[in-house]
Interface confidence: low
């Protein structure tokens, strides 16, 4: 009888992660008697995948009834494939020996390649807020994909970004890969409603890329602009001074009125109005009893926004002038704006 040959007809098999791989193997003869074993890899470090004779291999099933005496089909199925299962699988015939079975002949091997989808991209922004005109970095990470070829793009509100760096790790052969990309984005005052999108395209996604997003509302801080104005009220000895706080984000804001440098009132922005661009406006007013003052009064509206150093604007209230003659007096002195970021 012709000497037994072990035939593995498939040089390679490509399987998607989570599916079942079928590894085909037939023998041309029943002689010599002995079991078949499947290994991943060759040489002394090879990994036993299935032993026809003994052992428990919960992920492996045989294609045909391997216990039948005349069976020469030793194909197996491996369930729930992961990228870690990639490698070359060998079907090896053993002949019965004593005390141990002896390796007799091996098949040529079947390379199992696993196509694994990338994980949903996770986009992370900076740990602290930044103001418009600043450049901030966003990172995008996706893991567990195979093969290595992958395309990553960045978008801001649908416009593709070009200032980014991408790495796919590891550089050499691996069962699966990770991608890490960092994009630089320049903030504008209109970015409260903006989104940064990381888009990953891979062969396993069949043309339907995965996207991760970050809302710039989590990243941006738009400092307020202040305007202090004065209006007379019906009572001749009273003046209504308003502080308009405009175009700020986020909402966290505290306003303090000072009269000649002394704190008059502190309040936290509550009933704000929202602008179309997502920023907020707020107004606070102070009713000043002019008759209580002999000299001119310096009124200061001081705003602390989002934990940043205070910004203030002052208004000189002339006590000597009749309030009604001052209705249009909007002269205001800016006592300094500090937009230093505290991260």
């Amino acid at each position: 009888e012709e000497e037994l040959q072990v035939i593995q007809p498939d040089k390679s098999v490509l399987v998607a992660a989570g599916e079942t791989a079928t590894l085909r193997c037939t023998a041309t003869s029943l002689i010599p008697v002995g079991p078949i074993q499947w290994f991943r890899g060759a040489g002394p470090g090879r990994e036993l995948i299935y032993n026809q004779k003994e052992g428990h291999f919960p992920r492996v099933t045989t294609v045909s009834e391997s216990t039948k005496r005349k069976n020469m089909d030793f194909s197996i199925r491996i369930g729930n494939i992961t990228p870690a299962d990639a490698g070359t699988y060998y079907c090896v015939k053993f002949r019965k020996g004593s005390p141990d079975d002896v390796e007799f002949k091996s098949g040529a091997g079947t390379e199992l390649s696993v196509r694994a989808k990338p994980s949903a991209p996770v986009v992370s922004g900076p740990a602290a807020r930044a103001t418009p005109q600043h450049t901030v970095s966003f990172t995008c990470e996706s893991h567990g994909f195979s093969p290595r070829d992958i395309t990553l793009k960045w978008f801001k509100n649908g416009n593709e970004l070009s200032d980014f760096q991408t790495n796919v790790d590891p550089v050499g052969e691996s069962v699966s890969y990770s991608i890490h990309s960092t994009a630089k984005v320049v903030l504008t005052r209109e970015d409260v409603h903006s989104q940064v999108i990381c888009e990953v395209a891979h062969v396993t996604l069949q043309g339907d890329p995965l996207r991760g997003t970050a809302n710039l509302s989590e990243t941006i801080r738009v400092p307020p602009t202040l305007e202090v104005t004065q209006q007379p009220v019906r009572a001749e000895n009273q003046v209504n001074v308003t502080c308009q706080v405009r175009k700020f984000y986020p909402q966290r804001l505290q306003l303090t009125w000072l009269e000649n440098g002394n704190v008059s009132r502190t309040e936290t922005a509550s009933t704000v109005t929202e602008n179309k661009d997502g920023t907020y406006n707020w107004m606070s007013w102070l009713l000043v009893n002019v008759s209580a003052h002999r000299d001119d009064v310096k009124l200061t509206c001081q705003v602390e926004h989002d934990g940043q150093p205070a910004v203030s604007k002052s208004h000189d209230l002339k006590v000597s002038a009749h309030p009604k003659e001052q209705g249009s007096n909007t002269a205001a002195e800016n006592t300094g704006s500090n937009e230093r970021n505290i991260y």
């Epitope: 900076p126 740990a127 602290a128 990172t139 966290r252 502190t266 936290t268």
Partner: antibody, heavy 120, light 107 residues
């Protein structure tokens, strides 16, 4: 597993310096700030300062200004806090804490603490 | 700096009791307040963030309320594992500040 692992207890003499490390794992280190908080024996919690693991920016408590330095090493996902010119009232458990990722500051992940004893 | 004043400094209670701890900020901090639980020899654990939001994994018997300057932590039905020290912390601006702590002891 998401965790912050701190270096071991230290005994120092007055005037010396101590450097405590805090190694992060299980999350993207650069995405969060780290604060250092200390607790003297039998006392409450005292915030020492904050560092952005992303950009290295810092903000220190005024009383420690000039004596404390906070740094990060993104390659090892480790934050460091160095306190110089140690005094006996610096004896405390020093904690690193990760900010919870919100736009304000609270801490959802803490190290186990490092006991620093300052004694002559 | 924003001062945080906690009261009471200690409270004796029994299992099943309703316990309320208050925290007052020296100036308005909107809702930027967190509550922590600390047991002896352990690091603090975040219970409540943004004044009233329950941190993931924290039992629903803990609740927080308040805004501006006055805040409350409530334990609806005290359990044996709740005997600990509780701290409030403002996260509105630097420097971050903690309350002095409230020790919940067994009656």
């Amino acid at each position: 597993q998401v965790q912050l692992v701190q270096s071991g207890a230290e005994v120092k003499k007055p005037g010396a310096s101590v450097k405590v490390s805090c190694k992060a794992s299980g999350y993207t280190f650069g995405g969060y700030g780290i604060s250092w908080v200390r607790q003297a024996p039998g006392q409450g919690l005292e915030w020492m300062g904050w560092i952005s693991a992303y950009g290295g920016e810092t903000n220190y408590a005024q009383k420690l200004q000039g004596r404390v330095t906070m740094t990060t090493d993104t390659s090892t996902s480790t934050a460091y806090m160095e306190l110089r010119s140690l005094r006996s009232d610096d004896t405390a458990v020093y904690y690193c804490a990760r900010e919870a990722g919100s736009s304000w500051y609270d801490f959802d992940l803490w190290g186990r603490g490092t006991l620093v004893t300052v004694s002559s | 700096d924003i001062q945080m004043t906690q009261s009471p400094s200690s409270v004796s209670a029994s299992v099943g009791d309703r316990v309320t701890i208050t925290c007052r900020a020296s100036q308005g901090i909107s809702s930027w307040l967190a509550w922590y639980q600390q047991k002896p020899g352990k690091a603090p654990k975040l219970l409540i963030y943004a004044a009233s939001n329950l941190q993931s994994g924290v039992p629903s018997r803990f609740s927080g309320s308040g805004s501006g300057t006055d805040f409350t932590l409530t334990i609806s039905s005290l359990q044996p594992e709740d005997f600990a020290t509780y701290y409030c912390q403002q996260g509105a601006s630097f420097p971050i500040t903690f309350g002095g702590g409230t020790k919940v002891e067994i009656k």
